[in-house]
Interface confidence: medium
């Protein structure tokens, strides 16, 4: 079979929350992407930010390949990670307001994933191995959530290490692409 990047083949696995692989050292060089792989549109900027509301909870995007051992996605995926503090934006510059808002004994507002998206990706493997279709779970949006000192452990656990380690964010996934298209590292797959 041909190994077109824009084909419809392979299996999918969704990594557990918080078990996503670290992005590779090098970010994607957009110039290497051909039109079929990229749909004619440039990928998101590596660290493009977007304010979600008056709270400074930001959605950061970066581009990376998804890998599973020697196999790599035919095209990169755009990961979304949640970042920023969650006091009202107008209070953040104010030391008093911030101090009051972030009192250790008071409520803790965290910027955490709100919605997830299951993204299908096609993995291409070396040595003539069959391509694989994999499914990765990616953050689709972020929100500020109020956590208390009594339940922040369990609440954060629900989101894996996303809140604690935003650098491990994920990107929303398309579902209709070739079964050969993308995959994420599967040490966290289930």
């Amino acid at each position: 079979q041909g190994w077109q990047a824009f084909k419809n083949d392979a299996t999918e696995i969704i990594p557990e929350l918080g078990e996503y692989p670290e992005p590779p050292p090098e970010l994607e060089n957009n110039k290497t992407m051909n039109r079929a792989e990229n749909g004619g549109r440039p990928p998101h900027h590596p660290f493009e930010t977007k304010d979600v509301s008056e709270y400074s909870c930001r959605e950061l995007h970066f581009t990376r390949y998804v890998t599973d051992g020697p196999c790599r996605s035919a095209k990169p995926v755009t990961e979304l990670v949640c970042s920023g503090q969650c006091g009202p934006a107008r209070l953040l510059p104010n030391a008093i307001g911030r101090g009051k808002w972030w009192r250790p004994s008071g409520p803790d507002f965290r910027c955490i994933p709100d919605r997830y998206r299951a993204q299908r990706v096609q993995l291409l493997c070396p040595g003539g191995e069959a391509p694989r279709a994999r499914k990765v779970r990616l953050v689709a949006s972020c929100k500020c959530k109020r956590l208390t000192r009594f339940h922040n452990q369990s609440e954060l656990k629900d989101f894996g290490t996303e809140a604690a380690r935003p650098q491990k964010g994920r990107k929303p996934r398309p579902r209709a692409r070739s079964a050969k298209a993308n995959q994420a590292e599967l040490e966290n797959a289930y």
């Epitope: 749909g39 990928p43 995926v77 929303p172 996934r173 070739s178």
Partner: antibody
């Protein structure tokens, strides 16, 4: 060539269960998700769910979560769908289909399930 | 769930003419530069056959008279020139979001 073989028909009684099979050949069974689709007589297509043969992971359409159970037997490259508590609403043709990243590229011929006493 | 609305429900086209089928999604099926819309052909007593995937990509073995276009929420399947063997029901299907959903179908008949 890729083939998905399904039995032609099943006749079952109301309230009973039935286990449909789909034997795959011509490709690496564990490299593609297997989907199941329902089509009632003269009607459109409904996606039931999918299973990843490499690890048994399943994803279901909420409408079928209490109706269908998907499994696979890797040793025989066969996917199964069990339908439970059958009623006349379950009378339909059920297709298995190989799933890629974008679409279902190969389909079985379908198994016609008739629920009748 | 994403709802796909196909139109027309049926159409009659003369041999050699163009058949155009529309599919509108209740929300965008685009993601990261790709459109997760597919088209299938189904004849009576047969399973569906994949024609077009990712909005505009022709599946292997499918004649070039079939073409797909569109993005976001509006998609089109074109058949030109229509041949006798094209009489069938055509379905659009989105795979951008679970559950995968299908349009209601368009029955193509020959005049």
């Amino acid at each position: 060539q890729v083939q998905l073989l399904q039995p032609g028909a099943e006749l079952v009684k109301p309230g009973a269960s039935v286990k449909l099979s789909c034997k795959a050949s011509g490709y690496t069974f564990t490299s593609y998700w297997m989907h199941w689709v329902k089509q009632r007589p003269g009607q459109g297509l409904e996606w039931i769910g999918e299973i990843n043969p490499s690890n048994g992971r399943t994803d279901y359409n909420e409408n079928f979560k209490s109706k269908a159970t998907l499994t696979v037997d890797k040793s025989s490259s066969t996917a199964y769908m069990q339908l439970s508590s059958l009623t006349s609403e379950d009378s339909a043709v059920y297709y298995c289909a190989r799933g890629g990243v974008y679409a279902m590229d190969y389909w079985g011929q379908g198994t016609s399930v008739t629920v009748s006493s | 769930d994403i709802v796909l609305t196909q139109s027309p429900a049926s159409l009659a086209v003369s041999l050699g003419q163009r058949a155009t089928i529309s599919c509108k999604a209740s929300q965008s099926v685009d993601y990261d530069g790709d459109s997760y819309m597919n088209w299938y052909q189904q004849k009576p007593g047969q399973p569906p056959k994949l024609l077009i995937y990712a909005a505009s990509n022709l599946e292997s073995g499918i004649p070039a008279r079939f073409s797909g276009s569109g993005s976001g929420t509006d998609f089109t399947l074109n058949i030109h020139p229509v041949e006798e063997e094209d009489a069938a029901t055509y379905y659009c299907q989105q795979s951008n979001e679970d559950p995968w959903t299908f349009g209601g179908g368009t029955k193509l008949e020959l005049k």
